[in-house]
């Protein structure tokens, strides 16, 4: 089938296009090209007769067309009007006609675009800006770039007018950027020069520097004011409401107390018409002022709060010093000084942090000290202690118990007997007690500031007969030559005598034995294995006596240097070798053997049948006590001789 291919399909203005004919029939008389989609004599471009090889221009011929013998048509120096359809009319020798249509599109080389704006100086948070990419060009695509990046997604950015217009609603200072537009068609792309958006903003609230507000008489006062603003702000200074000067900096040399007052900086933006002011209060001291300490927390809670102590006033070019308990600051991770040393922070205060604290301001001649400040650290209550410590009383005596718990503010106390509230006092007094007064005595301490409560319970027994005592120990398995053991006879009873026996005998005299706590406690220093005996304590008063069950002290010791038996060291070949190792130790040790340094077995006995001279060597027994963590060993040399070579040799076991 006859077809027309346009090469290229999209043609740049001024270039050329070839309408290429495919499947041209044979035995042709001639052919003709027409502008449009049909054969129309008024729109004929050119005709060609094959026999004469003569081309004849038609009414639509522009002088830019060339026809080829293969019927293809070249159009040169393409113009916009050439866009559209072209029809080839083929006349065969048998005078039968055939037609085919092709087309192409002409695009201009795009001009360099430019950006027009509806507002050259938009005001922040007030104005919108519409950028338009010029000129408007048919069949062109429009794109926008901000700081050489594609447009960010933002509800304040809107494209319209076929993307030709970019609108920024409610501009902000951050919209100050480089904007470019790009135009594209199939044959060219162009980019505009950048347009910088100049957003007017501010002034923001001005900042006055430096920040310090306290000065000494004779110093220079040099204040600087700055406010973010576009265009840059115009500044004015007022002192106590009276205009001073229109400058960004205010300088007053050699100030006096009379220069104290309120200093106002006013920033003005002539384009936005806005004013903003900031006021600072300046204090000028005739003498260096006596410093004083302010605290951010007057009643800190122990282990909970931090406290920041600040040395006032803040004075320029001043050295601040601190003392705690009349000493310079100790090195502690809980103490932190600010960069200017003016603020001392105590992290996680404890009851030991009460102080006193002093700060000082150093001047040329001396150091001015603040009055001392004492921190009121709230703590407690700790676990209360009930005194006296007796738990057994005889009928008829007076019971007087006192309770105390470390606390700030001081704790409030309550007494309970067998869970029943008795009284809200620190001391409990019961006269002429009987067996019925036996029971659980509870002291409850409460800190009203922290809201914390702690209790201690004591069992009181009122009895004419003494109870059977028992022995408590602070170390159930002491290690020989290392540990001490303290035995205590329980309970603690009023008007009672305490006695001790060892293996049924009264205590031997020894510098390693010591009685204390009214003979209630027996301490053995540097225990030995010989102290592993039965210990009994006894209690007695005027009406009764009683003894505890015996307690046997389990002393851990060893291992001592082991002994290998039998003692023989020479053996005949063919004998059995049966070595046994023993070491005094508590608990029993673990045994292991090595022959010539090579580990053998973890047994107490080493047995080798029918030994030969190959069994000559060093036999080492190793002992280990896991409880004491100690080790020991012994080495024995064994010689094995060939049978009958030497008299007096053992035959072995």
């Amino acid at each position: 089938k006859l077809t027309i291919e346009s090469t290229p399909f999209n043609v740049a203005e001024g270039k050329e296009v070839l309408l290429l004919v495919h499947n041209l029939p044979q035995h042709l008389f001639g052919y003709s090209w027409y502008k449009g989609e049909r054969v129309d004599g008024n729109r004929q471009i050119i005709g060609y007769v094959i026999g004469t090889q003569q081309a004849t221009p038609g009414p639509a011929y522009s002088g830019r067309e060339i026809i080829y013998p293969n019927a293809s048509l070249l159009i040169q120096n393409i113009i916009q009007n050439d866009t559209g359809f072209y029809t080839l009319h083929v006349i065969k020798s048998d005078l039968v006609n055939e037609e085919a249509t092709g087309q192409f599109r002409v695009y201009p080389e795009l001009p360099k675009p430019s950006i027009s704006s509806n507002n050259s100086k938009p005001v922040e948070d007030k104005d919108a800006v519409a950028f338009t990419c010029e000129p408007e060009t048919q069949d062109a695509t429009y794109l926008w770039w901000v700081n050489n990046q594609s447009l960010p997604v933002s509800p304040r950015l809107q494209l319209s007018n076929g993307n030709r217009t970019l609108t920024l609603f409610n501009v902000t200072r951050n919209d100050t950027a480089s904007y470019k537009c790009e135009t594209q068609n199939p044959v060219s792309a162009r980019r505009s020069d950048s347009v910088i958006l100049n957003v007017l903003y501010g002034p923001d609230a001005p900042t006055i520097s430096p920040l310090n507000t306290s000065y000494r008489s004779g110093e220079n006062l040099n204040l600087s004011c700055h406010a973010a603003s576009n265009p840059p702000a115009q500044y004015s200074w007022f002192v106590n409401g009276t205009f001073q000067q229109s400058t960004q900096e205010l300088f007053i040399p050699n100030i006096t107390v009379n220069n104290s007052g309120s200093y106002t900086c006013q920033a003005h933006n002539s384009d936005t018409g806005l004013n903003r002011t900031t006021v600072t209060t300046i204090t000028v001291y005739a003498e260096p002022p006596k410093p004083f300490i302010t605290s951010n927390n007057s009643n800190p809670v122990e282990d909970e709060d931090a406290v920041a102590l600040t040395c006032e006033p803040e004075i320029q070019n001043t050295t601040y010093l601190w003392w705690v308990n009349n000493q310079s600051l100790p090195v502690s991770p809980r103490l932190q000084l600010s960069n200017d040393n003016r603020t001392l922070t105590l992290l996680s205060v404890t009851r030991n942090d009460v102080g006193p604290y002093e700060c000082g301001i150093q001047n040329e001649l001396s150091v001015d000290h603040s009055d001392p400040v004492i921190l009121n650290v709230l703590y407690g209550p700790d676990d209360p202690t009930i005194s006296p410590s007796y738990t057994y009383y005889r009928p008829g005596v007076n019971l007087s118990l006192s309770c105390h718990a470390a606390s700030n503010p001081p704790a409030q106390y309550s007494w309970l007997i067998d869970g029943n509230i008795q009284q809200h006092t620190q001391e409990l007094f019961i006269s002429n007690i009987t067996e019925k007064n036996s029971g659980l005595y509870t002291c409850q301490a409460n800190n009203s500031a922290s809201g914390h409560s702690r209790t201690t319970v004591k069992t009181i027994t009122v009895s004419a007969e003494l109870p059977k005592p028992s022995i408590s120990s602070n170390n159930s398995k002491p290690v020989e030559d290392k540990d001490a053991v303290a035995f205590t006879c329980e309970p603690e009873a009023q008007n009672t005598t305490y006695l001790w026996w060892v293996n049924g005998q009264s205590l031997p005299v020894s510098p390693r034995l010591q009685l204390s706590n009214g003979n209630r406690t027996l301490t053995l220093f540097n225990v030995t294995r010989n102290d592993a005996r039965a210990y009994v304590c006894g209690i007695q008063n005027s009406v009764s006596a009683n003894r505890s069950d015996p307690v046997t002290l389990d002393v851990l010791y060893g291992p001592d240097t082991p002994i290998i038996s039998p003692p023989d060291s020479s053996y005949l070949s063919g004998a059995n070798l049966n070595l046994s190792c023993h070491s005094a130790s508590n608990p029993s040790p673990q045994y292991s053997w090595r022959i010539n340094g090579i580990p053998q077995q973890h047994t107490q006995v080493l047995f080798i049948a029918k030994i030969t001279p190959n069994n000559n060597g060093t036999y080492a027994c190793f002992v280990s006590n896991l409880a004491t963590g100690r080790n020991n060993s012994i080495v024995k040399s064994i010689t094995v001789s060939a049978s009958g070579t030497s008299p007096g040799l053992s035959a072995g076991a």
Epitope: A12, E109, L110, S150, Q184, R190, R191
Partner: nanobody
Framework: EVQLVESGGGVVQPGGSLRLSCAAS????????LGWFRQAPGQEREFVAA????????YYADSVKGRFTISRDNAKNTLYLQMNSLRPEDTALYYC????????????????WGQGTLVTVSS
């Protein structure tokens, strides 16, 4: 201004492939549209392909369409031309060109040019 240096040329058999590179320096690469042109001995300089600033728009000469691919890597400041199904008539000196405001087939739109890299397609 931007400096351009082409590389990757060489001798290749018909039907073979080559990848040309153009390294740019001296200015922000993404601010330039780029094009490839070629010039065979005794012929005029001929447009091959062009790419815009962001890389989203490309344009090819009809003679290379479907065989050559132009691309750019703005992070590496480099322009590429992947040439497949090479023909003897592709033999030429290949130039890289840059413009801040134009991308298309007109060599006069490009003020900055490299020195060229030679591609020879021969069996």
């Amino acid at each position: 201004e931007v400096q351009l240096v082409e590389s990757g040329g060489g001798v290749v058999q018909p039907g073979g492939s080559l990848r040309l590179s153009c390294a740019a320096s001296g200015h922000t690469f993404s601010e330039y549209a780029l094009g490839w042109f070629r010039q065979a001995p005794g012929q005029e300089r001929e447009f091959v392909a062009a790419i815009n600033w962001g890389g989203g728009w490309t344009y090819y000469a009809d003679s290379v369409k479907g065989r050559f691919t132009i691309s750019r890597d703005n992070a590496k400041n480099t322009l590429y031309l992947q040439m497949n199904s090479l023909r003897p008539e592709d033999t030429a000196l290949y130039y890289c060109a840059a413009s801040s405001d134009y991308a298309g087939g007109n060599p006069t739109g490009y003020p900055y040019w490299g020195q060229g890299t030679l591609v020879t397609v021969s069996s």
